[in-house]
Amino acid sequence: EEELQVIQPEKSVSVAAGDSATLNCTVSSLIPVGPIQWFRGAGPGRELIYNLKEGHFPRVTAVSDPTKRNNMDFSIRISNITPADAGTYYCVKFRKGSPDVELKSGAGTELSVRAKPSAPVVSGPAVRATAEHTVSFTCESHGFSPRDITLKWFKNGNELSDVQTNVDPAGKSVSYSIRSTARVLLTRRDVHSQVICEVAHVTLQGDPLRGTANLSEAIRVPPFLEVTQQSMRADNQVNVTCQVTKFYPQRLQLTWLENGNVSRTEMASALPENKDGTYNWTSWLLVNVSAHRDDVKLTCQVEHDGQPAVNKSFSVKVSAHPKEQGSNTAAENTGTNERNIYGGSG
C-alpha cells in the first residue's frame, strides 16, 4: 500500500497582526484511521494548537468540514494573529489506539507575523548643554516584525550621520525593538531646531513613523554681557546699563553690586523673543556720584539657568575731571572684566 503522506504545501506564511492565518494541510490517504492534530513546535515541549476530537480552541477553526466523509483536508484558520503566534506549525497524523500513536508529521509551516513598530519615542539629555557641546538623543520603537527596519535621524531636515542603532534581539524572535542614539552638535542658533527620528518598516506601506524632540529642551545659550555708561546727567547721576543678550532659556537673575554690596536684584520675566528664540534684557542703575567720596565699583552679576554667576564690573572714578564731564568715551577695559568710568564731580 502507498505510504501515507502529510502535506503542508507552504514552507512559510506571513500575516499582519490582527489578521487571520490559514495553515494548509492535506493527507494522501484515509488510512490508517486516526486523528489529525496541529502543534506549534516539536518534541516534548510542543504546544497543541488544534485537536478536532477534543479541547476548546476558540481562535482556531477547520477550513473544511473535518467530519465529512472522505475528508482529506485538515487545514486550519487562526484568527486575530498576534506576534506571540509566530512559530513553526506542524500537522501531525495519529493512528487510532489507546492512546493514539503519532504516525507522521508534515514538514511544518513557519508562521511569521508582520507587526507595526510603535510610534518612535525620542528622548534628549537629562540636563541642558551649552552651545558648541555635543548631546545625545535616543529614539526607541518596539513590537515590530519582521526584523528589517530602517531608522534615520534628521536635524532641521538634514540627515545626521553620527548615529548608532541596535535592533534586539539578535536572533529570531516574535517581535523586535530598535534603539538608536544620535549625537548632535549644538550651536547658538539651535533654540528653534528640531531633531526627528524616522522609522520605515514594511508594515507602514511607505509612510514612515516619526518622533521629534525640540533642541530648546536640551540647549542652554549663555548670555553676552555688556555694561555701558549711558550718560552723565547734570545732577551728577551716572546712568549705567547692563545689557544681557542672546540667552536661552529665559530663567535669569540679575544683581547690581555697589562696592560689593547688593544694590538691587531683578528676575527676568515675560521677555520678548528674538527671531532665533533667544532673549535680551537690559537693566539700568543710576549712581549718584556726588554721594560718594571714593571711587565706586559697580558689578552687574548675572546668574543664568542655575549656572555659576557671570560678572561685569565698572569703576566709577569720583574725582574732579571737569573736561571729561559727561564723557562716555574714557572707559578703559581692564583684564578683569572691569571698566573705569570717570565721572566729574561738578
Partner: antibody, heavy 122, light 112 residues
C-alpha cells in the same frame, strides 16, 4: 555559526544558590531546546533539564525541587538556578542546544558551550 | 528513568585498527515512528562533548565517515573503522526517547 557561552561565579558557598547564564550568539533561540548538563570531576555526564523556545521546562527528577531554568529571548540567553547547593554539586556545567523536529522529536545535542567550573566550598 | 550501560569501561586501541563500543538501554529506544532515540558523543581530553551520531545511526555534520552507529531497541554499537590519534577521549551514549535524558557511564578510548 551558533556559539554558547556560560557565565557565572566559579565559587558558591554551601546552602547558597548557584546561578549560571548561557548566552547564545550567531543563531536563534527559536525551534530548539536549551539544556544544562553537568559533569562532576572525573565522572560522567548528567542531564539537569532543558527549556523549549515557548518557555516549557523539563527537569531531571533527581534535581527538580532545586533547579529552575528560564529563558530571556530578548537577550538571547537562558539561565540555570540551583538552590541549596552542597559539595556534591561541584562540577563543570555545560549549556547545550538540542535539535527537535516534528515527527522525530529530539535528534541530537549538537552545540555545546565550553563549560564553566563551579566549586561549592565554604 | 531509562538506565544506559556502556562497555567496555576502557578501550586501548591501535591506530589504524577498528574499535567497537557497546551501549545497552533498560528499555527499548525504538519508537513507533521507526526511529531509535540514541545518540553518541565524544569528549576529547579537556574539551566539551561533541555529537557524533544521532537517532541511532545518523552521522552528525562534520563527523568523519569512519564513525558509524548501529543497533535497534535496547542494543546499540558505535564502530570506528580505523582509529586515528585524534579519536582518543571518552565516548558516551545518551537516550533521547524520554526525559530525563540519561547518559551511559562512558568508555575511555586510549592509544595502546
Amino acid at each position: 555559526q551558533v556559539q554558547l557561552q556560560e557565565s557565572g561565579p566559579g565559587l558558591v558557598r554551601p546552602s547558597e544558590t548557584l546561578s549560571l547564564t548561557c548566552t547564545v550568539s550567531g543563531g536563534s533561540i527559536r525551534n530548539y531546546y536549551w539544556s544544562w548538563i553537568r559533569q562532576p570531576p572525573g565522572k560522567g555526564l548528567e542531564w539537569m533539564g532543558f527549556i523549549y523556545d515557548n518557555g516549557r521546562t523539563f527537569y531531571n527528577p533527581s534535581l527538580k525541587s532545586r533547579v529552575t531554568i528560564s529563558l530571556d529571548m530578548s537577550m538571547n540567553q537562558f539561565s540555570l538556578k540551583m538552590t541549596s547547593v552542597t559539595a556534591a554539586d561541584t562540577a563543570v556545567y555545560y549549556c547545550a542546544r538540542v535539535r527537535a523536529y516534528s515527527g522525530i522529536g529530539l535528534d541530537g545535542t549538537d552545540v555545546w558551550g565550553q563549560g564553566t567550573t563551579v566549586t561549592v566550598s565554604s | 528513568d531509562i538506565v544506559m550501560t556502556q562497555s567496555p569501561l576502557s578501550l586501548p586501541v591501535t591506530p589504524g585498527e577498528p574499535a567497537s563500543i557497546s551501549c545497552k538501554s533498560s528499555q527499548s529506544l525504538l519508537y513507533s515512528n521507526a526511529y531509535n532515540y540514541l545518540d553518541w558523543y565524544l569528549q576529547r581530553p579537556g574539551q566539551s562533548p561533541q555529537l557524533l551520531i544521532y537517532l541511532g545511526s545518523n552521522r552528525a555534520s562534520g563527523v568523519p565517515d569512519r564513525f558509524s552507529g548501529s543497533g535497534s531497541g535496547t542494543d546499540f554499537t558505535l564502530k570506528i573503522s580505523r582509529v586515528e590519534a585524534e579519536d582518543v577521549g571518552v565516548y558516551y551514549c545518551m537516550q533521547a526517547l524520554q526525559t530525563p535524558l540519561t547518559f551511559g557511564g562512558g568508555t575511555k578510548v586510549e592509544i595502546k
